[in-house]
Interface confidence: medium
């Protein structure tokens, strides 16, 4: 396989990182908020 | 719970290899980018290398290339540290990491290189 | 390679005080995105390190709001409102602007 540039620029595979980590976490929180009210209405 | 777990460190003479092993759980391995970084007794972060959600594109610093070879294997979720041709210069804790922007590390496995 | 560089390289501090930590670089992180590509990590003893701000600016999940980053270019800063004790450690900034990624040499924060 051949050899990659010497220094390379992976800031746009580390924009999309950010993104989809950004997405997750905010799933995450609204998956939280759901229990949490589901919670409140089970009481 | 995102959790990394790094082995295989230990001690080796100078010339010879060790293979270093990640195991992630706790996310999508094959969805995230995966990076080795390193730090010799008492010093500062090394970033060593890193690798690509399908293994095709992977990048290291100056001081490892020809020697060192990270891989991974999706199925296994797991990462990997070929060392070879290993040098005095080498010894530090290994750690492995989440991502680019290394969003989680492992405890580290510490390499020894000595005679 | 991009060179980073830390000052001060040790910062003794008083639990409750503001404190800053200065990172530089041998070039612009600014990308033509409008993001610096600069990360900050904190090592505490005996323990590996953590991501606390990405691109330049982004606390981290579950990293205190009283962590804040900035600066644009080649300069960047690390701001702590107030200092508290489990803040102890080492902190390294890291340009991620091209491959190789590399480090700062660390600045060391202390409780005085």
């Known amino acids: 396989s051949e050899e990659p540039p010497i220094s390379l620029d992976l800031t746009f595979h580390l924009l999309r990182e950010v993104l989809e980590m950004a997405r997750a976490e905010q799933l995450a929180q609204q998956a939280h908020s759901n229990r949490k009210l589901m919670e409140i209405i089970g009481k | 719970e995102v959790q990394l777990v790094e082995s295989g460190g230990g001690l080796v003479q100078p010339g010879g290899s060790l293979r270093l092993s990640c195991a992630a759980s706790?996310?999508?391995?094959?969805?995230?980018?995966m990076s080795w970084v390193r730090q010799a007794p008492g010093k500062g972060l090394e970033w060593v290398a890193n690798?690509?959600?399908?293994?095709?594109?992977?990048y290291y610093v100056d001081s490892v290339k020809g020697r060192f070879t990270i891989s991974r294997d999706n199925a296994k979720n797991s990462l990997y540290l070929q060392m070879n041709s290993l040098r005095a210069e080498d010894t530090a804790v290994y750690y492995c990491?989440?991502?680019?922007?290394?969003w989680g590390w492992g405890q580290g496995t510490l390499v020894t290189v000595s005679s | 390679d991009i060179v980073m560089t830390h000052s001060p390289l040790s910062l003794p501090v008083t639990p409750g005080d503001p404190a800053s930590i200065s990172c530089r670089s041998s070039?612009?992180?600014?990308?033509?995105?409008?993001?610096?590509?600069l990360d900050w990590y904190l090592q505490k003893p005996g323990q590996s390190p953590q991501l606390l701000i990405y691109l330049g600016s982004n606390r981290a999940s579950g990293v205190p709001d009283r962590f804040s980053g900035s600066g644009s270019g080649t300069d960047f800063t690390l701001k702590f409102i107030r200092v508290e004790a489990e803040d102890v450690g080492v902190y390294y900034c890291m340009q991620a602007l091209q491959t190789p990624y590399t480090f700062g040499q660390g600045t060391k924060l202390e409780i005085k």
């Open positions: 070039q612009s992180l600014l990308h033509s995105t409008g993001y610096n590509y």
């Open positions: 990491s989440r991502g680019l922007a290394l």
């Open positions: 706790g996310f999508t391995f094959s969805d995230n980018w």
């Open positions: 690798i690509k959600q399908d293994g095709s594109e992977n």
